[in-house]
Amino acid sequence: APVRSLHCTLRDAQLKSLVMSGPYELKALHLQGQDLEQQVVFSMSFVQGEESNDKIPVALGLKAKNLYLSCVLKDDKPTLQLESVDPKNYPKKKMEKRFVFNKIEINNKLEFESAQFPNWYISTSQAESMPVFLGGTRGGQDITDFTMQFVS
């Protein structure tokens, strides 16, 4: 079936927004007023994956850009990156595993677990203006909880 997508922004549990930091990196920082226009708008696509009653597989692209969040090994460590794709072929229902995240909703907060690397999550630091990364711990210092705001 044609892939179903929605546009949204994400904020971490500390209400930090996500913005571009160079061509292939996201960072998280507090934004207010007109600065909120800097935040990235995601195209969240509902894709095939190891779906369960608690986890919904999604791909996270950047709206109007041919960039997708993906999870790869770098120096033997699961790493989050922005990967450029052919816009003629993406998004698609059957995304490669590195592009897929399990969207988990707990108490009105969202977590995004890497399908490629189970128990690794899209994470932000407590500190301001630090890169968004793939973290291997929940409930620690790093933030793995997000809220989603729909964008028309």
Epitope: A1, P2, Q48, G49, K55, M95, K97
Partner: antibody
């Protein structure tokens, strides 16, 4: 060679819990998902639910409140428990291996067990 | 849930006949459809995956075609061992759903 074998009691009393085991060989339960499917006598096939390699489960909505699927990777066994059974749960129960071919055929099933008939009756 | 409409529900044919079974889905499923053969007292066997891909070891007289919402399963020349019940299964999204089955009988 991939093989799946269902086992369990052939007769269960109404309101009790139906418990079945699927023992597999030729593949690893940590890598491949397993589905359960049932077929009432003389009727068609109904997909019940599955357990993925990582342990996550998806249960078909009509059975969700009564269904538990779990597994023991080291014993190569998947279990199905269906509580509060009625005569409507009388069926041949099959387990089947998921293909798990990412970006090709993740949800398809290739190899099936031979099935086991469970009758719900007092 | 995706609804499956398989037809006919039963079919009488002779050895050597060409037989066609159709499966319609309530929404677009690309090519995410499998076809299975089931003989009495036996488990279903996978014949065709992804709409048209012949499963290894399955004779070439079996074929599948279609995409989107309309799918066709064909046996080009019926053999005695082909008399069985055939089911389609959509593997596009959960819950997985089967067609009602087509019982192929000897005329």
């Amino acid at each position: 060679e991939v093989q799946l074998q269902e086992s369990g009691p052939g007769l269960v009393k109404p309101s009790e819990t139906l418990s079945l085991t699927c023992t597999v060989s030729g593949f690893s339960l940590s890598e491949f998902g397993v589905s359960w499917i049932r077929q009432p006598p003389g009727k068609g096939l109904e997909w019940i639910g599955l357990i993925w390699g990582g342990g996550d489960t998806y249960y078909n909505s009509p059975l969700k409140s009564r269904l538990t699927i779990s597994k023991d990777n080291s014993k190569s066994q998947v279990s199905l428990k269906l509580s509060s059974v009625t005569a409507a749960d009388t069926a041949v129960y099959y387990c089947a291996k998921q293909r798990n071919l990412w970006a090709y055929d993740l949800y398809g099933m290739d190899y099936w067990g031979q099935g086991t008939l469970v009758t719900v009756s007092s | 849930d995706i609804q499956m409409t398989q037809s006919p529900s039963s079919l009488s044919a002779s050895v050597g006949d060409r037989v066609t079974i159709t499966c319609q889905t309530s929404q677009d499923i690309d090519m995410d459809l499998n076809w299975y053969q089931q003989k009495p007292g036996k488990a279903p066997k996978l014949l065709i995956s992804q709409g048209s891909t012949l499963w290894p070891g399955v004779p070439s007289r079996f074929s599948g075609s279609g995409s989107g919402t309309d799918f066709t399963f064909t046996i080009s020349s019926l053999q005695p061992e082909d008399f069985a019940t055939y089911y389609c299964l959509q593997t596009d999204s959960f819950p997985l759903t089967f067609g009602q089955g087509t019982k192929l009988e000897i005329k």
